[in-house]
């Protein structure tokens, strides 16, 4: 019947994403349980999209390499409830790569999955961005006004925050 | 890790055809979206096609519109450039590309999202 071919397919799904990520969790969205939305355990979610904290300390470039070969990227932030999310699973004396970066040193900033840069959904710390030089973006914590976006030298290695659309099943 | 392997290059005349293929080591080929780019002397490297994972949605650079198509066989684990009226601004070499993809529909058009990188393969158009 269909409830048995749709379970046989998505435990069929389930086993062929193993090899990227050997655990998913799953959820039912809504009332159909035909629509099951997962992200990689110990990935966080958040609306549509998955989240993982990624502890190593690398260049933007290699957090960026890493992120995509989990077939994600270096996080796009698209709205305050986002970064309100986001924090809650950062470390204050730390500071984290996003997917925001100036290649040509400009100020033109623009995020890595090409979704346009407004500046009026920035959180840039007061006087940020000021080098040139400075052409990726981070995220940290300053006492004065908490959790906000600063310019750094890209080949500085860093945390993360890698970010994927959910997988649905 | 996924291992690339291009062919297909040459030297050509303007307006002839040449095929590029791209093929992967990765068995399950068909949850890698793919693109290809180009670098020509003295330039950066240049986005120019790419495809889904499920081959139904595609994208290319402005230039190339019209001229050139990109397709996949997931069977054969290959990708494919299909590049007619060939001009010779299309000089350089050409790489594929590939990234892990959990949807059928998503497009990477940009370099740092693809980890996976093929060595190259040289096409040279002359007037």
């Known amino acids: 019947n269909f409830m048995y071919s749709k379970t046989v397919k998505r435990l069929s799904k389930l086993r062929e994403y193993q090899q990227y990520h050997p655990s998913l969790t799953c959820v039912m969205e809504g009332k159909d349980i035909e629509d099951w939305s997962c992200c990689p355990t110990p990935w966080t979610s958040f609306q549509s999209s998955c989240y993982f904290i990624s502890t190593g300390m690398q260049s933007w470039t290699k957090s960026q390499k890493n992120c995509s070969v989990m077939g994600a990227d270096l996080v796009v932030i698209n709205t305050r409830e986002e970064q309100d999310f986001i924090i809650q699973n950062l470390k204050r004396n730390s500071s984290y790569f996003l997917g925001l970066s100036d290649p040509g040193g400009r100020r033109h900033w623009q995020w890595v999955d090409q979704t346009p840069y407004n500046e009026n959904v920035t959180f840039w710390h007061s006087g940020e961005p000021n080098n040139l030089d400075e052409r990726c973006a981070i995220i940290n914590f300053r006492s004065s006004e908490e959790w906000g976006w600063n310019d750094i030298h890209c080949h500085v290695p860093q945390k993360s925050i890698c970010k994927m659309k959910k997988i649905y099943i | 890790q996924v291992q690339l392997q291009e062919s297909g290059g040459g030297l050509v005349q303007a307006g002839d055809s040449l095929r590029l293929s791209c093929t992967a080591s990765?068995?399950?080929?068909?949850?890698?979206?793919m693109g290809w780019f180009r670098l020509a002397p003295g330039k950066e490297r240049k986005f120019v096609a790419a495809?889904?994972?499920?081959?139904?949605?595609?994208d290319y650079v402005d230039s190339v519109k019209g001229r050139f198509t990109i397709s996949r066989d997931n069977a054969k684990n290959t990708v494919y450039l299909q590049m007619n009226s060939l001009k010779p601004e299309d000089t350089a070499v050409y790489y594929c590309?590939?990234?892990?993809?959990?949807?059928?529909?998503?497009?990477?058009?940009?370099?740092?999202?693809?980890?996976?990188w093929g060595q190259g393969t040289q096409v040279t158009v002359s007037s």
């Open positions: 590309a590939a990234r892990l993809d959990f949807s059928s529909t998503d497009l990477y058009t940009t370099a740092p999202r693809y980890p996976y």
């Open positions: 990765e068995r399950t080929f068909s949850n890698y979206a």
């Open positions: 495809i889904s994972t499920s081959g139904g949605t595609t």
